[in-house]
């Protein structure tokens, strides 16, 4: 069957150091257990996280993306997840996209992570 | 199956203050947003206040901002409304809602509370 | 803010008829959506979310479409469960508005 995918219609702010939650959905909701979910990077499709088979498929990782990130799967029975990524770099900061794969139907939503300096400020006055 | 059971209602004066509670079963409460909405008797639905599923981040209604706090104890399955100041505007039927996913791509809601009505007078 | 707003206020039909409801946005909202169902004295019920998917368990009956500002909700074939209070939803953006509501009576 077919579904759209949606992501944040907004960019997300998220500061260097500290961890970032992306959310992605099917539409209609629907398990996607059994489907390919995936994030990665434009312009080159760097592999941020992927899930497969059933489980993260780790080995398919940008080496920058080792060890940072985690699928929250708690509601991927209702199409819903979220990708969690720890320590936040000033690389970071970008367009993501994430899919979902079913056999061979596949659709996904573009998001988009500003990454701001906890420890910049502006001196008043 | 989901179950949302809000307490806490009641009769105010003016100025005073009340904390609703809202009760969640049926779910991973920490995984979904949850939010208050409200219905003053005879009017529409108003909302007030989103959380997220980890707490970290609120949204308020510019009526309630400054007045209202919403929060949440995962461990406890419960959603909470503090309301300071209370005007006799807020007199409504407050409903606790379970939000579809999270605050920035699912904040309509699939599952509603029976509502507790909330009364502002002197 | 984004403004909703939902006409008619009211409208009067009988069983069998095709219903539509019309939901506005002061500004685009993309598909983000939802339509709920409230009859008196009960908490509302979702039956549409973004724009167009049905809500699991909802009858096929009611539908919805439209994106960007124009929203419909349509029900083809209005059965006497289905008089109550309809409302429409934006979720693009805070804060969250509802449309004033459209209530469909028994004509």
């Known amino acids: 069957g077919q579904f759209r995918v949606i992501g944040p219609r907004h960019p997300i702010r998220a500061l260097v150091g500290d961890e970032v939650e992306l959310p992605c959905r099917i539409s209609p909701g629907k398990n996607a257990t059994g489907m390919e979910v995936g994030w990665y990077r434009p312009p080159f499709s760097r592999v941020v996280h992927l899930y497969r088979n059933g489980k993260d498929q780790d080995g398919d990782q940008a080496p920058e993306y080792r060890g940072r990130t985690e699928l929250l799967k708690d509601a991927i029975g209702e199409g819903k997840v979220t990708l969690r990524i720890r320590n936040v770099r000033f690389s970071d900061e970008g367009g993501f996209t994430c899919f979902f794969r079913d056999h061979s139907y596949q659709e996904e939503a573009a998001m988009e992570l500003k990454v701001e300096d906890p420890f910049y400020w502006v001196s008043p006055g | 199956q989901v179950q949302l059971v809000e307490s806490g209602g009641g009769l105010v004066q003016p100025g005073g203050s009340l904390r609703l509670s809202c009760a969640a079963s049926g779910f991973t409460f920490s995984s979904y947003a949850m939010s208050w909405v409200r219905q003053a008797p005879g009017k529409g639905l108003e909302w007030v206040s989103v959380?997220?599923?980890?707490?970290?981040?609120?949204y308020y209604a510019d009526s309630v901002k400054g007045r209202f706090t919403i929060s949440r104890d995962n461990s406890k399955n419960t959603l909470y409304l503090q309301m300071n100041s209370l005007r006799a505007e807020d007199t409504a039927v407050y409903y606790c809602?379970?939000?579809?996913?999270?605050?920035?791509?699912?904040?309509?809601?699939?599952?509603w509370g029976q509502g507790t009505l909330v009364t502002v007078s002197s | 803010d984004i403004v909703m707003t939902q006409s008619p206020s009211s409208l009067s039909a009988s069983v069998g008829d095709r219903v539509t409801i019309t939901c506005r946005a002061s500004q685009g909202i993309s598909s983000a959506l939802a339509w709920y169902q409230q009859k008196p004295g009960k908490a509302p019920k979702l039956l549409i979310y973004?724009?167009?998917s049905l809500e699991s368990g909802v009858p096929s009956r009611f539908s919805g479409s439209g994106s960007g500002t124009d929203f419909t909700l349509t029900i083809s074939s209005l059965q006497p469960e289905d008089f109550a209070t309809y409302y429409c939803?934006?979720?693009?953006?805070?804060?969250?508005?509802f449309g004033g509501g459209t209530k469909v009576e028994i004509k």
């Open positions: 973004d724009a167009s």
């Open positions: 939803q934006q979720f693009n953006s805070y804060p969250l508005t």
């Open positions: 959380i997220s599923g980890s707490g970290g981040s609120t």
């Open positions: 809602a379970k939000a579809y996913y999270d605050i920035l791509t699912g904040s309509l809601f699939d599952s």
